[in-house]
């Protein structure tokens, strides 16, 4: 399974480094159902 690396902000996913937006400062909607930002 892919490991979510919350401390570094990155995850190893299929041998590729992908930015992991569960990071505290994320504003990408990583949390299911959490309203982020305004209506855009």
């Amino acid at each position: 399974d892919a490991e979510f690396r919350h401390d570094s902000g990155y995850e190893v996913h299929h041998q590729k480094l992908v930015f992991f937006a569960e990071d505290v400062g994320s504003n990408k909607g990583a949390i299911i159902g959490l309203m982020v930002g305004g209506v855009v």
Epitope: D1, A2, E3, F4, H6, D7, V18, A21, E22, V24, K28, G29, A30, I31, I32, G33, L34, M35, V36, G37, V39, V40
Partner: antibody, heavy 112, light 111 residues
Framework: QVQLVQSGAEVKKPGASVKVSCKGS????????VHWLRQAPGKGLEWIGR????????IYTPKFQDRVTLTEDTSSDTAYMELSSLRSEDTAVYYC?????WGQGTLVTVSS | DIVMTQSPLSLPVTPGEPASISCRSS???????????LYWYLQKPGQSPQLLIY???NLASGVPDRFSSSGSGTDFTLKISRVEAEDVGVYYC????????FGQGTKVEIK
């Protein structure tokens, strides 16, 4: 009114594929992740994966890795979930979620 | 996979009385960054689910303050201080320390 509108119910035969759409209405879908979940009849919630419409990056639950494809069309503010090699256990309501908005759900029935 | 286990699976409640639901994870959800990656969702009858609590203790927007959540790294409790009729539905705990997994759900209904 801001909402996510999903495509209608589907009935498929085992082995077939299904493609469910999720269109943002009054909502720019390319700004936030789009998550996909499903709920089998009388069962709990199961996360399928998510897509970042800004760059197309996807993450899938390993269980679905080989059968699911998440895509998006930012020009039409629509995200898609395609599930292949359908089996009876895939009968479920499929939901898309982006930011605080949930789609109404799409019932996919797999039956011979 | 991190397994989320809820209890009870069914909870008859009386309006105006308190209620609580337990959730246990097979692995600690408390990360060294101080965040506990535990969430609570409610699915009301005939509706899509909605987020109630995120990162263990934060109330989502629009959620009444009669809802609260607490816990350790593996044991969590959702409390409703005074149940209202509109609180009926199925409550799910979930984690996203490693991908997302959900508990099996607790059905809350009026006695």
């Amino acid at each position: 009114q801001v909402q996510l509108v999903q495509s209608g119910a589907e009935v498929k035969k085992p082995g077939a594929s299904v493609k469910v759409s999720c269109k943002g209405s009054g909502f720019n879908i390319k700004v936030y992740y789009v998550h996909w979940l499903r709920q089998a009849p009388g069962k709990g919630l199961e996360w399928i994966g998510r897509i970042d419409p800004e760059n197309g990056e996807t993450i899938y639950t390993p269980k679905f890795q080989d059968r699911v494809t998440l895509t998006e069309d930012t020009s039409s503010d629509t995200a898609y979930m395609e599930l292949s090699s359908l089996r009876s256990e895939d009968t479920a309501v499929y939901y898309c979620v982006s930011s605080g908005y949930w789609g109404q759900g799409t019932l996919v029935t797999v039956s011979s | 996979d991190i397994v989320m286990t809820q209890s009870p699976l069914s909870l008859p409640v009386t309006p105006g009385e308190p209620a609580s639901i337990s959730c246990r994870s097979s692995k600690s959800l408390l990360h060294r960054n101080g965040i506990t990656y535990l969430y609570w969702y409610l699915q009301k009858p005939g509706q899509s689910p909605q987020l109630l609590i995120y990162q263990m203790s934060n109330l989502a927007s629009g959620v009444p303050d009669r809802f609260s959540s607490s816990g350790s790294g593996t044991d969590f409790t959702l409390k409703i201080s005074r149940v209202e009729a509109e609180d009926v539905g199925v409550y799910y705990c979930a984690q996203n320390l490693e991908l997302w997994t959900f508990g099996q759900g607790t059905k809350v209904e009026i006695k």
